[in-house]
Each structure stands twice: as structure tokens, then as C-alpha cells.
Interface confidence: medium
């Protein structure tokens, strides 16, 4: 179960939102906060460990999901094209 | 799954190359692709990689601030660009697909057949 | 850098180990790479530590323990005779994640 702790948005660059969320999350053993379907989820600590955040399903149904290259996040494509970038800190 | 490389050829100090992998057998826009390169009677070495939209790309430190890599998901074409060319970056280039989506020297799964580069005056 | 012997050798039947150590990324494994003339392309014979290609014969197998990394070939056989490099990712701050093999392994099949 997660619950999320804070939610700053901040919108004021054209075209571009920065969201920055924090989630607890009460995890089984061999498991620790992550991101699922875009929602805070229990996931397999091995995944954080080897920073393949994709095997998360991160992205919402129907988008891509894409580990960037420096493995510090993800992106989601939208069927249309659109991306969304999310960076792991 | 079949990878095809072009390109190559006898290339001048200094100048430019563009090779192009052309993929097919998969479903091209959802694997990360990269180039590795191999010298006359040397081993592997990495050249770079790029995600599967194209939105990012990393470098071997060699080719760092001269190669390019990009894509073009509608023609399942990858395509590295190397300027000012050096006698060094004469060898034998391959193009590799990633498995499972990400692609790492560990998780390469198919090779093209490569495309030989010879820098020389 | 991977370290990899420069060479090991066989005769055919026999069990073959060829050991990888080194490298920056452990979680993302280690893969191998059969390369049989310096003209031709490597084939993939192990990716992600043990996840065998399903055109590679089951005889070909990845193990790890600790940093070291393992390429067993189980009942080796003529057409085996190759050069085999290992892969992993190493770690810079300057580049980032980049791939880096060994130097290569011969295998000789007596």
C-alpha cells in the first residue's frame, strides 16, 4: 500500500510541467516503493537495484515505456507522440 | 531478426562518415540499438548507443563530441554519423540490437553482419 | 576493464569453463559473444548472465558467482572453436554507463 506525501508542480515554462512526488509505501520483504501504471506501487527491489525501471511498468496502458540511457529514469510515449520524462533522486 | 550495415568504405582523415543499419524480423521502435566497432585483429569496442524513441544516446568515450547516432522508427533504420575521422577509427562496424528493451554490453541478442571503415590517405 | 584468459583448449566431448571478472555493473549481468573468424560477426551465445538465444545449442550455459562470471560449454564440439568475448557495463562520470568487453578468450578444440 502507498500513499503519496507531497506533490509540487510547477507549470510555468511553455509546454513543460516539473512534478515532483513523494510516496510512502508500506512494502513486503524484497520489495520497496517504486512506480506502477503512473501510481506509487510496491515493486521487486531488484529492479531499483539494477535500475531497469521499465520491468516496473511505469507508464499508463498503451504508452511505451523507454529506460534512458544513463538509467537516472524513464520516458512514457503517448500513442501520440507526446513524452513524459520521469528521473529517479 | 536480420540487421544489415552500409556505409563503409574508404574514408579520408578528417572527413565524415554516415552508416546506416537497416533492421527488420521485429518490431524495430520497441529495442534500443547501438554500434560496436572492432579494429584489424583487435576486439570489441563500444561506440554508442540510442533509446528506442531516439531521445537519447550515450558514447564510447573514443567517438565522444564526434559521433551522432540516430533513428528513424518509420523506416527501422538506425544510423551512426563519425566526423573528423581519425586512422584509428578504421575497423569492422556492427550495428546490435538490445534484448528486453534495453541494450547494454551484456544484453546485445542479435548482430549485423558489419561494414568495414577504412580511414587512410 | 573485463579480464578473460587469453586462451583455453579442449578435446571434443570435454566440459569447458571460461571465467569473466571486472566490470561496473553487476545487476545488469554479463553477456558472451562468439566471434569465429576476425572478418565475421560475433553471435550472441549468453546475454543477461544465463538467457541463451534460441538458435544456441543448450550445450552453451552463463553462470555468476561473486564478480566472476562463467561461460560453460557442456559437451564442447568442433564447430566451438572460436573467439569468445565477454560483455558488461562499466561506470564513468565522464560517460556514463558504456559497454566494455574483454580482451577475448580462444578456444582451441584439440
Known amino acids: 500500500t502507498c500513499e503519496i506525501v507531497t506533490l509540487d508542480r510547477d507549470s510555468s515554462q511553455p509546454r513543460r510541467t516539473i512534478a515532483r512526488q513523494t510516496a510512502r509505501c508500506a512494502c513486503r520483504k524484497g520489495q520497496i516503493a517504486g512506480t506502477t501504471r503512473a501510481r506509487p506501487a510496491c515493486v521487486d527491489a531488484r529492479i531499483i537495484k539494477t535500475k531497469q525501471w521499465c520491468d516496473m511498468l511505469p507508464c499508463l496502458e498503451g504508452e511505451g515505456c523507454d529506460l534512458l540511457i544513463n538509467r537516472s529514469g524513464w520516458t512514457c510515449t503517448q500513442p501520440g507522440g507526446r513524452i513524459k520524462t520521469t528521473t529517479v533522486s | 531478426v536480420t540487421l544489415d550495415e552500409s556505409g563503409g568504405g574508404l574514408q579520408t582523415p578528417g572527413g565524415a562518415l554516415s552508416l546506416v543499419c537497416k533492421a527488420s524480423?521485429?518490431?524495430?521502435?520497441?529495442?534500443?540499438m547501438g554500434w560496436v566497432r572492432q579494429a584489424p585483429g583487435k576486439g570489441l569496442e563500444w561506440v554508442g548507443v540510442?533509446?528506442?524513441?531516439?531521445?537519447?544516446?550515450s558514447y564510447g568515450s573514443a567517438v565522444k563530441g564526434r559521433a551522432t547516432i540516430s533513428r528513424d522508427n518509420g523506416q527501422s533504420t538506425v544510423r551512426l554519423q563519425l566526423n573528423n575521422l581519425r586512422a584509428e577509427d578504421t575497423g569492422t562496424y556492427f550495428c546490435?540490437?538490445?534484448?528486453?528493451?534495453?541494450?547494454?554490453?551484456?544484453?546485445?541478442?542479435?548482430w549485423g553482419h558489419g561494414t568495414e571503415v577504412i580511414v587512410s590517405s | 576493464a573485463l579480464t578473460q584468459p587469453s586462451s583455453v583448449s579442449a578435446n571434443p566431448g570435454e566440459t569447458v569453463k571460461i571465467t569473466c571478472s571486472g566490470g561496473?555493473?553487476?545487476?545488469?549481468?554479463y553477456g558472451w559473444y562468439q566471434q569465429k573468424s576476425p572478418s565475421s560477426a560475433p553471435l550472441t551465445v549468453i546475454?543477461?548472465?544465463?538467457k541463451r538465444p534460441s538458435d544456441i545449442p543448450s550445450r552453451f550455459s552463463g553462470s555468476k558467482s561473486g564478480s566472476t562470471h562463467t561461460l560453460t560449454i557442456t559437451g564442447v564440439q568442433a564447430e566451438d572453436e572460436a573467439v569468445y568475448f565477454c560483455?558488461?557495463?562499466?561506470?564513468?562520470?565522464?560517460?556514463?554507463?558504456?559497454?566494455?568487453f574483454g580482451a577475448g578468450t580462444t578456444l582451441t578444440v584439440l
Open positions: 561496473g555493473s553487476s545487476g545488469y549481468g
Open positions: 546490435a540490437k538490445g534484448s528486453a528493451s534495453y541494450i547494454t554490453a551484456a544484453t546485445i541478442d542479435a
Open positions: 546475454y543477461w548472465n544465463d
Open positions: 560483455g558488461n557495463d562499466d561506470y564513468s562520470s565522464d560517460s556514463g554507463y558504456v559497454g566494455v
Open positions: 524480423g521485429f518490431t524495430f521502435s520497441s529495442y534500443q
Open positions: 540510442i533509446n528506442k524513441s531516439g531521445s537519447d544516446t
